[in-house]
């Protein structure tokens, strides 16, 4: 059973490849199946196949197997690229070396050790014998190839074509002799697929019998092909997980190449005065840890016993007691001469890359692998492994653990706004990191907007001028007070959260602010029964350049007839042009005897391109902005309305689609307003609400 389940380990996989037969005489067998494993089982056992199966192709699109009596090295066959195909070739037929006694050898060597040509197995001339192909099914006694059907001591052999010499062994090297590695084999990409005790290696793309993190797609540069021995993690030499359920992993017997040289690509950049990257190439002579304690010699076992010896870690320059990074740690380190302190980092060695200036990310930074570990608010990032439970709480897939090393800024949840990290601070559980998008990177971080133009956008300044007084259900409208005066609008999106604008906070002292809810009059006149006055407990600034702030209330608002929340749009959604929307505010209204009542101005959605034309081409809108024009000339938002909402209705649902932020001018005829597009930041808002703790009512 186990043998059958694991037969795919006996095949070499070539992704996106198929075989096309040029010779029409070559046979093929096809059948619908679910997995490549099923194809492999049948190929290995030759069950129901009218030929000896040497390879197969799994068609992922059609869920179909194509079994072949040939492989890519056979004549009359050519390889072809195809997205939906994966080619699997039985390793025994393409190997030029033997494992152990060579019982499984199915290569094409047909000359003996002394150079005599082999006699075909099906022939009785010049030597009669009982090794007929029909008697040794599965042993591939084809042509006159060297074989070892009984697993005898000397390895593969054949009857010879010389009448004087009945049989002789063939000179086929052991795979462990052919295969060699440099240093500790981190760059080894050979075909050794069994351990030093002879156990077959588990495929890297399989999770049975042993679950592991080294998935080929996660580590495309580690050479995780098929089930070949590799050294992805700085071990003394290559290893693999085994097919033995009781032996998780074992080293492989791969000898060191005679000419122990490395390709340039294998070598980290060598430096002597400073650290490049994680300092794996540091070859300087600093020999104390950061606080001055001297290092222990690498070839010594006192005071600390260890296996980081120069013998185990060749090419890592473990000379004397110099700081080194042989194992892919954060930076160079050493064992110390203090019996109470086993290891320490040599963090006093300066960084060669003296600046964060080069640190940038592309797209949304999901592939960012830099080593910045501080948030934009100056907090040190906390280790990812301590926060996996929290991460699983807000993402619905398995995060790529290979990228989540140490406490470096990363983007495991596909956040549209770049790398971030957890902080360990309960008030600010996570925050973005101060990394910018790479210069010239125009990858859209969101793809389904109307006509996104990636550029440096400019926003239109608007205020509710000449609006109509309103008293309809606008319970989500918030008056943000600064030192007892109205300063900005805001939208209650959750009982404890108000969405508003960055520009509304001239002071950092939260005691300077209050949120007034349930009011119609900016001074609260006549609103005593419905007014709720709440203190502000925290400001959460939006992603860089967003102009948004989520304001956390000191206690949750009580939802009633006068106070309600407003819905958020779906992330990345677009709303059709000409949709009727409204902006609300208590700001400057253009009237001399301003009565202080909440005003509404009716606008309609305008596409970004048309909007730009109305601004005489001076404004290019990007994916984070939304445009709305006034139905009434000179009507729109103004100072004191900043932070307030652009509210639109779709499918009988009202939602906050935009936030009013400062820009240029005020209610200028034919100049539509430009707002922060809430849909672009909806995931950020949900993430904050989900991860930041709020007081219970």
């Amino acid at each position: 059973q186990r043998k059958r389940r694991n037969t795919i380990h006996e095949f070499k996989k070539s992704a996106k490849t198929t075989l096309i037969k040029i010779d029409p005489a070559l046979k093929i067998k096809t059948k619908k199946v679910n997995t490549a494993d099923q194809c492999a089982n049948r190929c290995t056992r030759n069950k129901g196949l009218p030929f000896t199966c040497k390879a197969f192709v799994f068609d992922k699109a059609r869920k179909q197997c194509l079994w072949f009596p040939f492989n890519s090295m056979s004549s009359g066959v050519k390889k072809e690229f195809g997205h939906e195909f994966d080619l699997y070739e039985n390793k025994d037929y393409i190997r030029n070396c033997i494992i152990g006694k060579g019982r499984s050898y199915k290569g094409t060597v047909s000359i003996t050790k002394s150079g005599i040509k082999c006699q075909p197995w099906s022939s009785m001339i010049p030597h009669e014998h009982s090794f007929l192909p029909s008697s040794y099914r599965g042993k591939d006694l084809q042509e006159n190839y060297c074989r070892n059907p009984r697993g005898e001591e000397g390895g593969p052999w054949c009857f010879t074509s010389n009448p004087e010499v009945r049989y002789e062994v063939c000179d086929i090297p052991q795979c462990s002799e052919v295969e060699c590695m440099t240093c500790n084999g981190e760059s080894y990409r050979g075909l050794m697929d069994h351990t030093e005790s002879g156990k077959i290696c588990q495929r890297w793309d399989h999770q049975t019998p042993h679950r592991h993190k080294f998935l080929p797609e996660r580590y495309p540069d580690k050479g995780f092909d098929d089930n070949y021995c590799r050294n992805p993690d700085g071990q003394p030499r290559p290893w693999c997980y085994t097919l033995d359920p009781h032996t998780r992993w074992e080293y492989c017997a791969i000898k060191t190449c005679a000419d122990n040289t490395m390709n340039d690509t294998d070598v980290p950049l060598e430096t002597t005065e400073c650290i490049q990257g994680q300092g794996e190439g540091y070859r300087g002579t600093v020999n104390t840890i950061w606080n001055g304690i001297p290092c222990q010699r690498w070839d010594s076992q006192y005071p600390h016993e260890h296996d980081m010896t120069p013998e185990n870690f060749k090419c890592k320059d473990l000379r004397e007691n110099y700081c080194r990074n042989p194992d892919g740690s954060e930076s160079p380190w050493c064992f110390t001469t203090d019996p109470n302190i086993r290891v320490g980092y040599c963090s006093q060695i300066p960084n060669c890359d003296m600046s964060h200036g080069q640190d940038c990310y592309r797209g949304n930074g999901k592939n960012y692998m830099g080593n910045l570990s501080q948030t934009r608010s100056g907090l040190t990032c906390s280790m990812w492994d301590k926060n996996m439970e929290d991460l699983h709480r807000h993402i619905f897939w398995e995060p790529d653990a290979s990228k989540l090393n140490e406490n470096y800024c990363r983007n495991p949840d596909d956040d549209a706004h770049g790398p971030w990290c957890y902080t360990g601070n309960p008030l600010i559980p996570w925050d973005y990191c101060p990394i910018s998008r790479c210069e010239g990177d125009t990858t859209p971080t969101i793809v389904n907007l109307d006509h996104p133009v990636i550029s440096c956008a400019k926003t239109k300044q608007l205020r509710v001028v000449n609006g109509i007084p309103t008293r309809t259900n606008i319970g989500w409208m918030v008056s943000l007070r600064y030192r007892n005066k109205h300063i900005c609008g805001g939208s209650l999106i959750k009982e404890s959260w108000v969405l508003t604008a960055r520009q509304c906070f001239p002071s950092r002292d939260l005691k300077d602010y209050e949120a007034w809810l349930g009011i119609h009059d900016v001074h609260g006149r006549g609103d005593e029964k419905c007014k709720q006055v709440l203190n502000v407990s925290q400001l959460v600034y939006g992603p860089e350049g967003s102009d948004l702030v989520l304001m956390k209330l000191a206690r949750p608002a009580v939802l009633d007839d006068f106070v309600s929340t407003i819905d958020l749009p779906n992330y990345g959604c677009t709303i059709p042009e000409k949709t009727s929307c409204s902006v609300y505010g208590w700001g400057y209204t253009g009237l001399i005897n301003y009565d202080g009542l909440l005003r509404v101005a009716h606008l309609y959605i305008m596409g970004n391109e048309k909007c730009s034309q109305h601004h005489r081409g001076k404004v290019t809108l990007n994916e984070s902005e939304i445009c709305a024009g006034a139905e009434k000339i000179g009507s729109g938002p103004c100072e004191g309305d900043y932070g307030g909402p652009l509210v639109c209705e779709q499918h009988k649902m009202r939602m906050v689609l935009g936030v009013i932020v400062p820009g240029r001018g005020c209610a200028i005829p034919n100049r539509p307003g430009i707002f922060v597009r809430v849909a672009y930041y909806a995931k950020w808002i949900h993430k904050i609400i989900l991860t930041y703790k709020v007081p219970q009512s």
Epitope: Q374, R376, S377, G378, C456, K458, T459, Q461, Y482, K485, I487, C488, R502, Q503, C504, F505, P506, S507, R508, D509, L539, Y541, D547, G587, Y588, E639, G640, Y642, V661, P662, G663, R664
Partner: antibody, heavy 119, light 110 residues
Amino acid sequence: EVQLVESGGGLVQPGGSLRLSCAASGFTVGRYYMSWVRQAPGKGLEWIGIIYTHGVNPDYASSAKGRFTISRDNSKNTLYLQMNSLRAEDTAVYYCARVGGFNDYSDIWGQGTLVTVSS
Amino acid sequence: DIQMTQSPSSLSASVGDRVTITCQASESISTYLAWYQQKPGKVPKLLIYRASTLASGVPSRFSGSGSGTDFTLTISSLQPEDVATYYCQQGYSYSNVDNAFGGGTKVEIK
């Protein structure tokens, strides 16, 4: 390119007035808090005041209160510092600066313009 | 109102030395503190914001720490190009402020 360029500096007599301009390019001044900072010859940086992006009045250092006024013209993307009742101790290089981040630091500075108050 | 006090007003150190400058606020300003570098005849340049976050393009030998009222700017290994005057600035509140900046620290090479 994001930059600020000051102009309007020069020699002025004590008691006189001067208006400094700060033209922005590459960003919209209306979206940011903007500050004026000065530096007397051989002395340190002195904060003059800040203009906000909403209806709140600008804030000034006590040395500038009542004599200096910060304003802006969003249509011209320009910041201004109107200086009245100038004194000899107002002699300095005047810088305008954009207030970035969470409105808490000056990330872009102009090259400065020299104002000399002397009879 | 918030006052910023910087010390020392000047210092002289050798190339490779570790240099520390301190800044004290008269009341808590959380981490809303920035550090600027001004070389002779040049415009001030932002080094560190939010007390410890390195601004873009700034060498990693510069670091900042502190919160509340006490802050520190450290140059781990002084270089000749670091000769300049360094200023701290609070960004906590702008009302009733005499000067948002500290008095400055002039750094020279011995």
